[in-house]
Interface confidence: low
Amino acid sequence: RRGAPAEDQDCGRLPDFIAKLTNNTHQHVFDDLSGSVSLSWVGDSTGVILVLTTFQVPLVIVSFGQSKLYRSEDYGKNFKDITNLINNTFIRTEFGMAIGPENSGKVILTAEVSGGSRGGRVFRSSDFAKNFVQTDLPFHPLTQMMYSPQNSDYLLALSTENGLWVSKNFGEKWEEIHKAVCLAKWGPNNIIFFTTHVNGSCKADLGALELWRTSDLGKTFKTIGVKIYSFGLGGRFLFASVMADKDTTRRIHVSTDQGDTWSMAQLPSVGQEQFYSILAANEDMVFMHVDEPGDTGFGTIFTSDDRGIVYSKSLDRHLYTTTGGETDFTNVTSLRGVYITSTLSEDNSIQSMITFDQGGRWEHLRKPENSKCDATAKNKNECSLHIHASYSISQKLNVPMAPLSEPNAVGIVIAHGSVGDAISVMVPDVYISDDGGYSWAKMLEGPHYYTILDSGGIIVAIEHSNRPINVIKFSTDEGQCWQSYVFTQEPIYFTGLASEPGARSMNISIWGFTESFITRQWVSYTVDFKDILERNCEEDDYTTWLAHSTDPGDYKDGCILGYKEQFLRLRKSSVCQNGRDYVVAKQPSVCPCSLEDFLCDFGYFRPENASECVEQPELKGHELEFCLYGKEEHLTTNGYRKIPGDKCQGGMNPAREVKDLKKKCTSNFLNPTKQNSKSNS
């Protein structure tokens, strides 16, 4: 579909691009000696960036620290030192900058306070960091302030003494609503879920915690779970891992009504050394990783039904090192249904796998055209692409960035990888897919930092090097041709690329420092590509593209989860602006149903390489554990259940005799008599 990338030669050079970019390159030198810099975007399409620099000297008795705060309101072209707005206070970098949701314009900075103080101190802004108000807290925060997704005036925080504190007026006043809290999270509709320890401490009571809920910011409470190990929220599901009565194992329970009623998930139980992890969740379903016993570094991915109760095995030997460890699981946001992850083979080699149908089937990534198989390949003509993600980064391989995709840059996926039978420890190259992962091409030789601008209209890259750099590369044709631009005559030690989240901007900021014998000076260069894409895209610049198309002759071509989508996409040859207001235009159409649109319901399974669901053997010797809403149920099924999010209509309807699965529920979790309500009066 596409040739190997070319850099400068053999490519349609853009006229006068050097002059255009030179006129739109803005340098800012930061007048401080800080050791670290953190950057946050405030709001969407506001152009406001906050930069916090910190300088810390650990002395024998105390540590001396200094912070500086800078603000830009033009996407990083110019910065103003606003440290005076926070009274030149040292800001605790471990709390970061707490930026409010959506376009609230809210920012909270947590200050360092002296040892004997009664509580912490924060600086609050609600006008995109134009002004800050200093507020002394009645507690020492343990975590960053958490905004309610529904109302940015509502905040929660945990204190160092495990108190749960809530503010209803953007941190001006605080109230401790509960003590002995281990973990707290905002749910929908300003609900707060939290676990509490009853006897000793969070660590000692693990597996004996209680799960509580408050729907009125701490006026009243309801205990919605006991014997809790941990809990999590994903999509519309609330999950809790609950200790079994008889042993030290635990099981996942799920609720779709904020904890009023619970069902036992049909997932394996796990022991003390194992873990569950929600890999991804949406309003329809959840991907759940269940760790294998022993220190194997892998487990199994299961995908749920629409209730979050019945799970199908999706992928074996899924790489996931330890609790809170590394997994390469990646949601490819540029195409519906696509996920990439890694598996650990018997020989301990790591291989990449991709699914195009939300975990229904996994396969190897297709070998890029015109690429050679590396030393890991047994057969030099047959191999596949393997993607470097979090695990490779954690192993300090020469991988500066994880895979990148953006919802508004349809079909584009950029990642470091190698071509062979498994991930290679050799220096990787950068590969690109323009069709959501079906086909790949080498984009750049060697490791690079990369980012997407103007909804895919421009891709920018900088070589990963331990030497100072002064060249930025860019492509206006989805990575086929590359131009190089020298953005400064004085090379800098590069530390990062920054562009506004959402990939709609045409500005990119290159961060780094210059170092002389005694000083290090932070510097940023912001390059605006607006004059490269000088005209607005017009009708002829776009073409229609059928996503997931693999067999154009087939009437079901492009059907994934019961429907196909046709997109309007920018032609590679068009050099024009999608613009900040660009919204992906797509036309969905429904597909007829087939057995692929159904998963096997409780008590049924699909034998290897079969499409029909067959009833499970009677599982003699132990009862099926099926607990729906915490009490014995009469479950009826025809063995099939529509895959979550599947929109197929007509076609094949797997009608068969409806069975009555009268099974004893073996879970006494949340026996209704155990539920109680409390009032905080």
Epitope: S455, E539, Y542, L568, G579, D581, Y582, V583, A585, Q587
Partner: antibody, heavy 126, light 107 residues
Framework: QVQLVQSGAEVKKPGSSVKVSCKAS????????ISWVRQAPGQGLEWMGG????????SYAQKFQGRVTITADESTSTAYMELSSLRSEDTAVYYC???????????????????WGQGTTVTVSS | DIQMTQSPSSLSASVGDRVTITCRAS??????LNWYQQKPGKAPKLLIY???SLQSGVPSRFSGSGSGTDFTLTISSLQPEDFATYYC?????????FGGGTKVEIK
């Protein structure tokens, strides 16, 4: 240069429906958003809804939801607006208009409408 | 829906005059504002898009400014063919909404 030519004037009884057509000529039709805007006698302009023909799906103002249907036929480069349950206050000139830029913007009509039909007068009277 | 308020609703001016029409949005609409000119019995004509960008073919005596909630259409030197009704239109929120119009008449 694109031109939009609308169907002729209509006189309708209350409770009935009217369907107005808008044919594009002299340029491409499919990918631009086509809006329908009405203007009651002596009054201002009111956006009713729009469609991007290539995608078929229409977007409607809440006020007209359930009463208006906007469709497009790519093969004849024609857009249609049907308004049902007519009442006297629906008496107006109905215009079709083309969004001035390609619809990166889905069903939000950001950059204004640069090509307009000549207008179709619909009179609702018993 | 976002309300658009134009003022004045009508004005009288002479050829060569500088004319200013204002439009206020009920909430911030960034720069998603367009201006149209309409003559009796005719369809509207797009003059300005994105608050300040002049539509192709429109004379340079027309200019637009503003962002957020307050916007202005200025005709630097009124010509005989400029006597018409002018409408502003916001396109930040759905549905797009128009102002009530400003009628520019001959003094």
């Amino acid at each position: 240069q694109v031109q939009l030519v609308q169907s002729g004037a209509e006189v309708k009884k209350p409770g009935s429906s009217v369907k107005v057509s808008c044919k594009a000529s002299g340029g491409t039709f499919s990918s631009y958003a086509i809006s329908w805007v009405r203007q009651a006698p002596g009054q201002g302009l009111e956006w009713m809804g729009g469609i991007i023909p290539i995608f078929g799906t229409a977007s409607y103002a809440q006020k007209f939801q359930g009463r208006v249907t906007i469709t497009a036929d790519e093969s004849t480069s024609t857009a249609y607006m049907e308004l049902s349950s007519l009442r006297s206050e629906d008496t107006a000139v109905y215009y079709c208009a083309r969004e001035s830029r390609i619809p990166g913007s889905g069903y939000y009509y950001y950059y204004g409408m640069d090509v307009w039909g000549q207008g179709t007068t619909v009179t609702v009277s018993s | 829906d976002i309300q658009m308020t134009q003022s004045p609703s009508s004005l009288s001016a002479s050829v060569g005059d500088r004319v200013t029409i204002t439009c206020r949005a009920s909430q911030s609409i960034s720069s998603y504002l367009n201006w149209y000119q309409q003559k009796p019995g005719k369809a509207p004509k797009l003059l300005i898009y994105s608050a300040s960008s002049l539509q192709s073919g429109v004379p340079s005596r027309f200019s637009g400014s503003g962002s957020g909630t307050d916007f202005t259409l200025t005709i630097s030197s009124l010509q005989p063919e400029d006597f018409a009704t002018y409408y502003c239109q916001q396109t930040d929120g759905k549905p797009p909404t128009f102002g009530g119009g400003t009628k520019v008449e001959i003094k």
